[in-house]
Interface confidence: medium
């Protein structure tokens, strides 16, 4: 799997999308996990509804929410009130029994808010030609600012 990069702005919401083959993954619940090391485990953050038919319902763990369009074949994860510690490696997974297939490997990068008094420097504008060896960049920034949101806490 190549790594897909999603970049968001501190304090705002970032939406991560993971497309998949809806027929191949029919009847399977999905999950979003955080990679804890290069070869380490992927720690579950949030998973879709226990009843697959209700996967379209949004489920939340702290500031992370997940919803699955099982017909269209798109898993959507929303990270609210993005903070520097949210930066890192994640995976979208398709669950079957105790196994999990990786749908997409994701790198989340967090930028300082360019409209804040802390200037972010030259903010990259989507559409500029960039060349990456093994990554695809998705610029996915929402302007909605949510106050007082508590980020998903790590577990040791």
């Amino acid at each position: 799997h190549n790594t897909t990069v999603f970049q968001g702005v501190e304090g705002q919401s970032l939406q991560v999308s993971c497309p998949y083959d809806s027929m191949k993954h029919w009847g399977r619940r999905k999950a979003w996990c955080r990679q804890l090391g290069e070869k380490g485990p992927c720690q579950r953050v949030v998973s879709t509804h226990n009843l697959w038919l209700l996967s379209f319902l949004r489920r939340r763990n702290g500031s992370t929410a997940i919803t699955d369009d099982t017909l269209g074949g798109t898993l959507t994860i929303t990270l609210r009130n993005l903070q520097p510690h949210d930066a890192g490696f994640y995976q979208c997974q398709s669950l079957h029994g105790s196994e999990a297939d990786t749908l997409r490997k994701v790198l989340v990068e967090v930028l300082a808010d360019p409209l804040d008094h802390r200037d972010a420097g030259d903010l990259w504008v989507p559409g500029e030609s960039e060349s990456f060896e093994d990554a695809h960049v998705e610029h996915s920034i929402s302007r909605s600012l949510l106050e007082g949101e508590i980020p998903f806490p790590p577990t040791s």
């Epitope: 990069v5 090391g37 500029e128 960039e130 990456f132 060896e133 960049v137």
Partner: antibody, heavy 119, light 107 residues
């Protein structure tokens, strides 16, 4: 193994510029952002800013805004930090540091580059 | 900006002692705190991240605790190689900020 190797010590006059390099090896360069952190003699650590190795996006500390520029060269897996209009209080050891999997902390550091600003 | 204040600024201890260093944030940073060890002329080394998670390869005598604004680094039984400066760092919000450091000296 992961390594960040920085360029050598520099002596500069006030008002001049300095450009420090940080060559990364042992990992996929574009998968990790690099921060620059400096440490004045006998002082604590000061975060200067961060650059995305993917596309050169930057976040700079406000106090250095306008004087600092961070760039990357993916062909050589090298990150550069240029500081302009040097003052005596810019005398410090400058470190590059990789932001790893560990929730916004820095898991690998360069050996440091001493920049001395003196007339 | 979030200010990080460490105490004490220096501490003297002997091999085998239990040592505690504290770090206080000027506002709530949840659990987004890291601890580093730095020896003279060397780069910092990551010990603890996310307040209490031990970085791979770091001896288990090091431990971290706390959340919100008050955090603690504990060395359960000091070894000769532990004499160094210890710094905390918050990653809750930009700009990233560090404590001023705590120097651990041989008594």
């Amino acid at each position: 193994q992961v390594q960040l190797v920085q360029s050598g010590a520099e002596v500069k006059k006030p008002g001049a510029s300095v450009k420090v390099s940080c060559k990364a090896s042992g990992y996929t360069f574009t998968n990790y952002g690099i921060s620059w952190v400096r440490q004045a003699p006998g002082q604590g650590l000061e975060w200067m800013g961060w650059i995305s190795a993917y596309n050169g996006n930057t976040n700079y500390a406000q106090k250095l805004q306008g004087r600092v520029t961070m760039t990357t060269d993916t062909s050589t897996s090298t990150v550069y930090m240029e500081l302009r209009s040097l003052r005596s209080d810019d005398t410090a050891v400058y470190y590059c540091a990789r932001r790893g999997y560990s929730y916004g902390s820095f898991d690998y550091w360069g050996q440091g580059t001493l920049v001395t600003v003196s007339s | 900006d979030i200010q990080m204040t460490q105490s004490p600024s220096s501490v003297s201890a002997s091999v085998g002692d239990r040592v505690t260093v504290t770090c206080r944030a000027s506002q709530d940073i949840n659990s987004w705190l890291a601890w580093y060890q730095q020896k003279p002329g060397k780069a910092p080394k990551l010990l603890i991240y996310a307040a209490s998670s031990l970085q791979t390869g770091v001896p288990s005598r090091f431990s971290g605790s706390g959340s919100g604004t008050d955090f603690t680094l504990t060395i359960s039984s000091l070894q000769p190689e532990d004499f160094a400066t210890y710094s905390c760092q918050q990653s809750n919000s930009f700009p990233i900020t560090f404590g001023q450091g705590t120097r651990l000296e041989i008594k």
